[in-house]
């Protein structure tokens, strides 16, 4: 079944102004790529490359397309039914706990550790202790000996908004 988005599902800044609120019309909703008119009678297309809606909805306006930040590459453009997909540039990654920016991947592992995972757009390189095999979560490699690695370039997105 198709998901639907209503006014109540939106963050406060995305909701219509109070005077624009209206009850759903009997036929109800507009398709993805559209929003509903203020009188609830018509469906209005989102503007290609400017805004979008992903589900059947009774929104009074479409959602603004995301613009990729510097340090990000655009994997796919915004259409009327899907938001822009941005991905961290090669050699950088975005963590769940700091989704607002891409951070540089470490160039290598601290001494006594080996690399078991490459830098990807959504994760730093992964290091484990040679003996125990336990993961290292430290931010910066030890200054002394590092095992260098070249950044990976997988194609899947690190942030899929929309």
């Amino acid at each position: 079944e198709s998901a639907l988005i209503t006014q109540q599902d939106l963050a406060p800044q995305q909701r219509a102004a109070p005077q624009q609120k209206r009850s759903s019309p009997s036929e109800g909703l507009c398709p993805p790529g559209h929003h509903i008119s203020e009188d609830g009678r018509d469906c209005i297309s989102c503007k290609y490359g400017q805004d979008y809606s992903t589900h059947w909805n009774d929104l009074l306006f479409c959602l603004r397309c995301t613009r990729c930040d510097s340090g990000e590459v655009e994997l796919s453009p915004c259409t009327t039914t899907r938001n822009t997909v941005c991905q961290c540039e090669e050699g950088t990654f975005r963590e769940e706990d700091s989704p607002e920016m891409c951070r540089k991947c470490r160039t290598g592992c601290p001494r006594g550790m080996v690399k078991v995972g490459d830098c990807t757009p959504w994760s730093d390189i992964e290091c484990v202790h040679k003996e125990s095999g336990t993961k290292h979560s430290g931010e910066v490699p030890a200054v002394e000996e590092t095992v260098t690695s070249s950044p990976g370039t997988p194609a899947s997105p690190c942030s899929l908004s929309g």
């Epitope: 079944e1 198709s2 639907l4 036929e27 109800g28 909703l29 398709p31 993805p32 790529g33 559209h34 008119s37 018509d42 469906c43 209005i44 297309s45 503007k47 290609y48 059947w56 259409t79 009327t80 039914t81």
Partner: antibody, heavy 119, light 107 residues
């Protein structure tokens, strides 16, 4: 391949009703919106309304709202358009057409059903 | 409702000619315009959507342009099989509406 196969031609008297069917195949029925568009002889095209099987959403052109009813039978992937209180100016070819859940253009069309209203 | 006014309503051109059909919307429809080709006794076929995007399998001699209220369908080099009636359609706001059509024939 995608096919929209419509029912055969109909001749009706003024005041009567007609029900035209459109059987869809070659794609997932619940993922696309199906529309009815009509074309009077030698005239342009006129959008009548849609039905979306994914959530049973229906929208009618206000011009036809009081006389048209669009329904569907999901078990047979068929959409129906019933037009009541027929008048001579309803004589037209009625098409079903499909569109993705996005911009409202029609990528596949049925072959059309000629409905003639005559006393 | 938005009116779509097509011109000319009839057009005669020679094979190889560059042919242009225009469509004017009664209000701004952004780039939400599609073009269809309809041959006698057949259903319309989608050629162009979003004013300039060619539908799958449509020959490259067909192109579309425009935004706001003025739109154009161009056939760069007319072929005998292009004899048909061409319709524009706005898909910006319901009810979606069509132009009156342009009947194209070969001289």
């Amino acid at each position: 391949q995608v096919q929209l196969v419509q029912s055969g031609a109909e001749v009706k008297k003024p005041g009567a009703s007609v029900k035209v069917s459109c059987k869809a195949s070659g794609y997932t029925f619940t993922e696309y919106i199906l529309h009815w568009v009509r074309q009077a002889p030698g005239q342009g095209l006129e959008w009548m309304g849609w039905f979306y099987p994914g959530n049973n959403n229906i929208k009618y052109n206000e011009k036809f709202k009081d006389r048209v009813t669009i329904t569907a039978d999901k078990s047979t992937s068929t959409v129906y358009m019933e037009l009541s209180s027929l008048r001579s100016e309803d004589t037209a070819v009625y098409y079903c057409a499909r569109h993705e859940q996005g911009p409202g253009y029609f990528d596949y069309w049925g072959q059309g059903t000629l409905v003639t209203v005559s006393s | 409702d938005i009116q779509m006014t097509q011109s000319p309503s009839f057009l005669s051109a020679s094979v190889g000619d560059r042919v242009t059909i225009t469509c004017k919307a009664s209000q701004d429809v952004n780039t939400a315009v599609a073009w269809y080709q309809q041959k006698p006794g057949k259903a319309p076929k989608l050629l162009i959507y979003w004013a300039s995007t060619r539908h799958t399998g449509v020959p490259s001699r067909f192109s579309g342009s425009g935004s706001g209220t003025d739109f154009t369908l161009t056939i760069s080099s007319l072929q005998p099989e292009d004899v048909a009636t061409y319709y524009c359609q706005q898909h910006y706001i319901t009810p979606w509406t069509f132009g009156g059509g342009t009947k194209l024939e070969i001289k």
